[in-house]
Structures are given as structure tokens and as C-alpha cells.
């Protein structure tokens, strides 16, 4: 959590951002909140990016003001105009690209004063893994697949019964470049699995950590997946 205060002017206002991560090709949110004002027309929001000459986005007098917007952000940004009055200056970024990573500044002016806070935005690719029994294999085998990751993640298998066991000798992981030549499909195969056990396939890079669990019994198969973004800290 980064909390910024005004440096000069009438008074300082508190501006709060949250470091976050964007998934390539999807929409991202750059979070920023501030002490609200009574009049929308008195609020100015400016989003800036380190190393970029033009503005990322500007909102003033109740509407977008995009004449100074940098070309790389044109048509890709929006603030939630109906939420500005309650202190939400968050920015929606369409079609996140690797090049969108960097340090952003959320700069706010209201009738109460000025304030700003920085935000570290990471970009990459992350997706939920799915673990299935591979019935085509000669022995009992599990197959863990996740369609989109970048940078290349690590894959670790674990089991509930054999806690702390190292499965690297009985697993094989491959990374297949997707058609856009950036993200990769992750496929990991675990051999010699036993029934009445829960296995976890954990995929992790510096942006996200995802886990796919599978419980195999004689009568049923249960699956569960979850994904967690790393380093989402507020400022």
C-alpha cells in the first residue's frame, strides 16, 4: 500500500494506490483512491507513467481530457466516472501489454488540496491450471495444464500423503510457446500416482502463483484450482 500526500499548495490530501499485476491481452485495473470532494467539477485526476512523455489519462471537470494522452494509451484507458465523486480514481487499462509494466503515478487535485502516490505495475501472463487423469498413459498418470504463463514459471508437484516428497524425478514439465510468441502453455505430467491421495500442481512465477488439486479415489475424482497474484501491496 502506497499512501501519498500533497507536497505543496493549499493542503495535502491522502492518495492511496495498490501495486498490482496485469494479465497480457486482458483488461487491467490500476487502483487509486483519494479523499473525496463534494463537487465533481473540482476534481482533477492525472495518471502518469515513468518514462512516458504524454499522460496516461486525465479526467477533469467531470469528463475525460485526452488531448495530452500518450499514443500508446489511446483508446485503452477509462476512469470509472460515476465513482470519482466517492474518491475512486482507478484506471481501467484495456488489452494489457508487456510494455505497460512500470511505475505509475496517480496525481489528484481537489478543492481540499493535492496529493499523489506511485504504483508498481507488473505485467505477465497467468492462468488457472487444470489437473486430469491421463487415461492414455500406460501407468497411472496425472496431467496438469495451464494455457498462458509468462515469464516461464516453475512447476512443483506435491501430495497430501507424501508431504515433503520431491516429485521432480517422477514428473516431466514442458513449455510450449503460444501463437502470439510471448506466452506459453504449461504442461506437467506426474507418473506413478496412487489412488486415495490428493495431488497438487503448483505453478509460480514472479507475478502469480496457481495451484490445481486433484483427489483420486476409486469412486470419484475431485478437482479444485485457485490463483493468487503476488506482490499486491498497497501504497
Amino acid at each position: 500500500l502506497i499512501i501519498g500526500f500533497g507536497i505543496s499548495g493549499r493542503h495535502s490530501i491522502t492518495v492511496t494506490t495498490v501495486a498490482s499485476a496485469g494479465n497480457i491481452g486482458e483488461d487491467g485495473i490500476l487502483s487509486c483512491t483519494f479523499e473525496p470532494d463534494i463537487k465533481l467539477s473540482d476534481i482533477v485526476i492525472q495518471w502518469l507513467k515513468e518514462g512516458v512523455l504524454g499522460l496516461v489519462h486525465e479526467f477533469k471537470e467531470g469528463k475525460d481530457e485526452l488531448s495530452e494522452q500518450d499514443e500508446m494509451f489511446r483508446g485503452r484507458t477509462a476512469v470509472f466516472a460515476d465513482q470519482v465523486i466517492v474518491g475512486n480514481a482507478s484506471l481501467r487499462l484495456k488489452n494489457v501489454q508487456l510494455t505497460d509494466a512500470g511505475t505509475y503515478k496517480c496525481y489528484i487535485i481537489t478543492s481540499k488540496g493535492k496529493g499523489n502516490a506511485n504504483l508498481e505495475y507488473k505485467t505477465g501472463a497467468f492462468s488457472m491450471p487444470e489437473v486430469n487423469v491421463d487415461y492414455n498413459a500406460s501407468s497411472e498418470t496425472l496431467r496438469c495444464e495451464a494455457p498462458r504463463w509468462f515469464p516461464q514459471p516453475t512447476v512443483v508437484w506435491a501430495s497430501q500423503v507424501d508431504q515433503g516428497a520431491n516429485f521432480s524425478e517422477v514428473s516431466n514439465t514442458s513449455f510450449e510457446l503460444n501463437s502470439e510468441n510471448v506466452t506459453m502453455k504449461v504442461v506437467s505430467v506426474l507418473y506413478n500416482v496412487t489412488i486415495n491421495n490428493t495431488y497438487s500442481c503448483m505453478i509460480e512465477n514472479d507475478i502469480a502463483k496457481a495451484t490445481g488439486d486433484i483427489k483420486v479415489t476409486e469412486s470419484e475424482i475431485k478437482r479444485r484450482s485457485h490463483l493468487q497474484l503476488l506482490n499486491s501491496k498497497a501504497s
Partner: antibody
Framework: QVQLQESGPGLVKPSETLSLTCTVS????????WGWIRQPPGKGLEWIGY???????SYNPSLKSRVTISVDTSKNQFSLKLSSVTAADTAVYYC????????????????WGQGTTVTVSS | DIQMTQSPSTLSASVGDRVTITCRAS??????LAWYQQKPGKAPKLLIY???SLESGVPSRFSGSGSGTEFTLTISSLQPDDFATYYC?????????FGGGTKVEIK
Amino acid sequence: QVQLQESGPGLVKPSETLSLTCTVSGGSIISYYWGWIRQPPGKGLEWIGYIYSSGSTSYNPSLKSRVTISVDTSKNQFSLKLSSVTAADTAVYYCARGSGLYAAPDYGLDVWGQGTTVTVSS
Amino acid sequence: DIQMTQSPSTLSASVGDRVTITCRASQSISSWLAWYQQKPGKAPKLLIYKASSLESGVPSRFSGSGSGTEFTLTISSLQPDDFATYYCQQDNSFPFTFGGGTKVEIK
């Protein structure tokens, strides 16, 4: 409801500049993206460029060196200028509004003018 | 630029038929896709936005689906008024680009 009307000369000489204006009626030009699209005879649609009401523009790279789109909010109009025209620029030119949530051009072009035919010939 | 490829380019069908038109993007565009209908001498008309959302006033026999790079426009029961040319368009990133069009004609 919002209506768009293109206007400008139907005949332009090669190497000259094509100039068209789109007048927005029944609504405000403010807080929207406005675009120009063209369609050569018997062919598909080609996106020329967009302008936001505050003046921010984005052009098709294939036409960028020749295109200028401007806006006049006081007249509720936006304009297209295409320089150094050739016969390949002969087309029906449409103006349209980009729609979307929170003023971003995400939801297609929801309002179109009826189109104006421009022929490039000497 | 993102290339949009439509197939087929021409489709012959009869009233009452179920018609499907495909649009492929050269890279992922998430759900940022619109579909238009155009009749000869007329401006295009927005049918579907954000891949599957029906524009106000458009009959419910039109539907859109897909995400990423593969999209479809489906007309569940073709009506006489539906014989036209259909275009897809990505509004994921500038420059916005259109597919080459699919002409739906009477069989």
C-alpha cells in the same frame, strides 16, 4: 436520438485534399470517440481514424501521413482531411460514433452517418 | 495491426436456416469484438458488441459468441430481412480493423 450527417465535395482531383465534415445532431459531441470509416466500391470497410471530443486522435498507420481529423465542439462537428489523394481513395466515407462504458471506445460503432461518396478523378 | 479474417466470404441459405459466420483475429482480442450488418447502399448497423452483447433493438435471433481469437455470429432462423453483408470488427486496440465481410445470399 443522435444523428450524423457527412458533408463535403463529391469530386476531388488527384493530388488535392479531400475535406469532409460530420455534423452531430440530437446529442452532444462531448465525452465520445468519433470515427471515420471508408468503403471503396464493392469492397469492405476500412477504419481511417478516431478523435476524442477533447482532440486526441488515432489514425490508421496506412493513412497516417495523409490524414488529419479535427473537432469543433462549439459547432458539434468533426472533420476529416485526406491529402494527396489518388483514385485509390475513391470510396463511400462514413462518420460514426464509438460507444462504450465510461467513454472508452469499446462497444463498437453504434451511430453512423448515411455515408457520402467521394470520387477522385481529374 | 490485428488482422481479422472472416469465413465464409459468401454464404447461400434459405429462410428459416440457422446461419453461422466465423471471425478469426490474428492475436487475442479478449472479448473486444463487434458485428455489423450492411445492406446495399446503406451504412453498417451495429448488431453485437463485446462479442456477445446484443445491441438495443436488434432481434434476439442474432447472437454472438467466442473470445480470444475465435468468434461466431449466429442467426438462429434466417429471415428475409437478414440477407445482407456481415462484418466483424475488433475494438481491442488501435488501429481498429474490420473483417473482409460475409455476404449472406438467397439459395
